[in-house]
Amino acid sequence: FPTVTEERSAPSAQPVYTPSRDKPKAHLTIMRQTPVPHLKNELAALHWENNLGMAFTKNRMNYTNKFLVIPESGDYFIYSQITFRGTTSECGDISRVRRPKKPDSITVVITKVADSYPEPAHLLTGTKSVCEISSNWFQPIYLGAMFSLEEGDRLMVNVSDISLVDYTKEDKTFFGAFLI
Amino acid sequence: FPTVTEERSAPSAQPVYTPSRDKPKAHLTIMRQTPVPHLKNELAALHWENNLGMAFTKNRMNYTNKFLVIPESGDYFIYSQITFRGTTSECGDISRVRRPKKPDSITVVITKVADSYPEPAHLLTGTKSVCEISSNWFQPIYLGAMFSLEEGDRLMVNVSDISLVDYTKEDKTFFGAFLI
Amino acid sequence: FPTVTEERSAPSAQPVYTPSRDKPKAHLTIMRQTPVPHLKNELAALHWENNLGMAFTKNRMNYTNKFLVIPESGDYFIYSQITFRGTTSECGDISRVRRPKKPDSITVVITKVADSYPEPAHLLTGTKSVCEISSNWFQPIYLGAMFSLEEGDRLMVNVSDISLVDYTKEDKTFFGAFLI
């Protein structure tokens, strides 16, 4: 997942004008994840609810197979919150040894896959060391920013450890985007 | 405060078009909370400054009695940051006992109250275990996402412990919304 | 950096209507900072990439000398994430003395400088005590909110310790704004 370094300028294919109420937008909410084997150090993609409860997609914004698909070129605000939860992390054991243990961590990446570019690009990353001494810990990582996207670009949310994601509440873990 | 699970589809009553400069919007800032008794395990609603300093309400967005009142159906981006502060939390006492203590926690919930639905709905929740070993700790919880709201819906911010909210600065603790 | 306390009402000079695609907007990404001496307790301003990779400025939004310059009066959504990283913080040494050490902290401030007002105003502040017992820690602070800005206002991002900012990835540390 290298970071794209040349993703230049305003999209040229933008339509003349899309009034706000017709702009592509989506708010997706967490659902229980089906176990999918993935490599230890590889980020896992989350899948989302796009229809029940608070979740919706509108105005040609489409959700398919873990991806939000961008229907119209333009500048989008993209956001996500992932709530993580776990039990005591490794380095929480305050040992007497001289060298502290490497901390555990939690990471969220919002990734863009473009037809025009072979490599997925990391748009947003939130990463946090976790070093908790209590028996159970929980905390959110929030991300949000604006990006120039092209029609057909696909967005997904990846996490460092899918088993630590709190999938119990739609208001705790979510993913969304709207054309500005 | 159960979470609504069926809150479907685009509002039908949306006006044909509201140009950006006329769109309902508000940015509210923290003020010192007046002493109000509330039940121990109940989330407390915050009240807000809507006029002084950076705070404002515009274009029929109205603030009344702890609620932001939505004047027009549509899709709104809603956000809040609450900065919490406290003294050493319980589980920070690293005892020699085998079982670590249950962590203290801080929680923020942005809640919607709708005339059409009897139960308040949790739109956004940020919750974090707090297990600090320093004498004083402080940290923010940030939330933001887009929701389809109806005219007359009311939004409020609830917190797990009102006495831990940093009310000293308008730039540390705030709440806002705007029609997209 | 005192907080402005009287910054009232909607700007009067707002143009009749700016369609979305022509609205001023920018997303700036982190770059390696050139060492600049500054006083110990003074917040340091970050400088930003405005052109390479994901970074852009559009529609007369201008970046110059650490500042985003607002080209048109109106209501802007402003956001930033700063990822910090460091080694064990002071108070992580769980000593046997009665008085816990004062925690280290990390702070981000988005500041507005206006021609019409002599003092810089803190729009947004994210501040967090850091008391880590692992050898290396890292964590983001995210901020975002809407403000009424005037043509010519300048925005910058200040941090408590520039040496703790993770400048390695454009998706970890960024700053942006767009006219709503």
Partner: antibody, heavy 119, light 110 residues
């Protein structure tokens, strides 16, 4: 230096009202909340409420709700505390105190104003 | 209604060390802002001695120190002096954001 200077002693009849003033100097009056605390003769300290001089907002102790009014005059950097429907048990020394924003401790105190309620 | 409880009186000889405790009836006392200590010498207004459990404002001698354990806070005075004689109050904020004072402790220097 920071100073809070209070008005002089008052004698009032039961049922009357009293208005105590607290003039601040040596700092920006609107930047710090003012609290009022009273002390009955030979008794401990009792908190009455706070006032934000910038906004005029107040927060009162449950016990005094409906009977106390705290106000500020920004032009003279003066805070006021008015207590109505006085009774004999309101006889006390009334103090104003400036608060530390970060910890809400009472850092600077006025010299106190004795209010005697007697028929 | 939350309560802060202090011993009514303590005493010590000059040069000695005394500790005044302040116990809360509720776990949320001081959670956000800590416990503060005030000294009131006879006929004068109270003076802030310790803020946020531990911190001494400038001008307060280091003979005064504060600590915390569970739902209790303590003020310790070492090297007692005759001029320390007076009343000492702990203060905090409860979960409803009301300020609370302890009943006060009279310190007598023997």
């Amino acid at each position: 230096q920071v100073q809070l200077v209070q008005s002089g002693a008052e004698v009032k009849k039961p049922g009357a009202s009293v208005k105590v003033s607290c003039k601040a100097s040596g700092y920006t009056f609107t930047s710090y909340d003012i609290n009022w605390v009273r002390q009955a003769p030979g008794q401990g300290l009792e908190w009455m409420g706070w006032l934000n001089p910038n906004s005029g907002y107040t927060g009162y102790a449950q016990k005094f709700q409906g009977r106390v009014t705290m106000t500020a005059d920004r032009s003279t950097s003066t805070a006021y505390m008015e207590l109505s429907s006085l009774r004999s048990e309101d006889t006390a020394v009334y103090y104003c105190a400036r608060e530390v924003p970060e910890t809400a401790a009472f850092e600077y105190w006025g010299q106190g104003t004795l209010v005697t309620v007697s028929s | 209604q939350s309560v802060l409880t202090q011993p009514p009186s303590v005493s010590g000889a000059p040069g000695q060390r005394v500790t005044i405790s302040c116990t809360s009836s509720s776990s949320d006392i001081g959670a956000g802002l800590g416990v503060h200590w005030y000294q009131q010498l006879p006929g004068t207004a109270p003076k802030l001695l310790i803020e946020g459990y531990y911190n001494r404002p400038s001008g307060v001698p280091d003979r005064f120190s504060g600590s915390k354990s569970g739902t209790s806070a303590s003020l310790t005075i070492t090297g007692l002096l005759p001029e320390d004689e007076g009343d000492y109050y702990c203060q905090s904020w409860d979960g409803t954001l009301s300020a609370l004072f302890g009943g006060g402790t009279k310190l007598t220097v023997l």
